[in-house]
Interface confidence: low
């Protein structure tokens, strides 16, 4: 009997390991898809940009390294902000490093001052985990400083030099990001 229980437990553990592996594969696949989509989008932009207009970023976008950023002049709720970025062939800003955060906050200070700007960060309703739009988790130093008390869905935004959280249905400016075009020589 004990042997039987032990065998079942081992089988269950094996099944669990397989499921975890599958989940890990899925997460990796999802991330890779998001990256591929960005590269594909950059490739399409490259192909479509004419020889006359080979600047790395469109008009009114700011460049930093291989990214272009658009700081909106109009506000909307988080979901609509994401839609608006998608229409421009971009996504809501995903902050990958402290260097990128410093560039963004420095640029905002010059452009507009201390307003709120949606970024592509939202909180999973079930687990409470913060996730970027490509499914990845922000690095520990880039987690929103305050947990919103809202019972509604919570999303991330940048204000001054902080990453904060708020009800996704509130109105804010937003920042879109896309890959900069490589200049064709």
């Amino acid at each position: 009997k004990l042997l039987q229980v032990s065998t079942i437990a081992m089988q269950q553990q094996e099944k669990l390991i397989q499921q975890e592996r599958a989940l890990l594969n899925f997460t990796e696949w999802k991330r890779s898809c998001a990256l591929q989509m960005k590269y594909c989008q950059a490739f399409m932009q490259n192909s479509l940009s004419s020889a006359h207009n080979s600047s790395p970023c469109p008009n009114n976008w700011i460049q930093n390294r291989e990214s272009c950023y658009y700081v909106s002049e109009i506000w909307s709720i988080w979901h609509t902000s994401q839609e608006n970025c998608l229409k421009e062939g971009s996504t809501l800003l995903q902050i990958e490093s402290k260097e990128e955060m410093d560039f963004i906050t420095g640029s905002l200070r010059k452009i507009k001052g201390s307003y709120d700007y949606w970024v592509g960060l939202s909180q999973d309703g079930h687990s409470g985990r913060w996730l970027w739009q490509d499914g990845s988790s922000p690095s520990p130093g880039l987690l929103p400083a305050e947990r919103s008390q809202s019972a509604n869905q919570v999303c991330g935004y940048v204000k001054s030099n902080s990453l904060l959280s708020s009800n996704c249905s509130t109105w804010k400016y937003f920042i879109c990001e896309k890959y900069a075009l490589r200049s064709s020589v």
Epitope: S72, I74, W75, I77, T80, N84, W171
Partner: nanobody, 120 residues
């Protein structure tokens, strides 16, 4: 349902000023941006300026920035657009609207429109 009633349009010389008003009634406006869009003859309707009713934040289009000023009277539920340094290209029908997003053009309620003509 939100009802919007514009007034104050008219004919003005280039360089002149005009103030148009929009009185809103009906449903609560707290979920909306209320403001102005315009449509010039043969052109698409375009965003001019709007106020986020709950936060009071105001947005202007590039063409309106610096020349037009949006304000509101909470007690009267009325939005005003003060237009200065008017140019012939500002000639259009100006529509008051309540929108759930000004950028994506998701306008939920439109007014009837008021004609603004700027002569050179």
């Amino acid at each position: 349902q939100v009802q919007l009633q514009e007034s104050g349009g008219g004919l003005v010389q280039a360089g002149g000023s005009l103030r148009v008003s929009c009185a809103a009634s009906g449903r609560t406006l707290s979920n909306y941006a209320v403001g102005w869009w315009r449509q010039a003859p043969g052109k698409q309707r375009e965003f001019v300026a709007a106020i986020n009713w709950s936060s009071g934040g105001i947005s202007y289009s590039n063409s309106a920035k610096g020349r037009f000023a949006l304000s509101r009277d909470n007690a009267k539920n009325t939005v005003y657009l003060q237009m200065d340094s008017l140019k012939p290209e500002d000639t259009a029908v100006y529509y008051c609207a309540a929108a759930s997003s000004v950028l994506s053009g998701t306008v939920d309620y439109w007014g009837q429109g008021t004609q603004v003509t700027v002569s050179s």
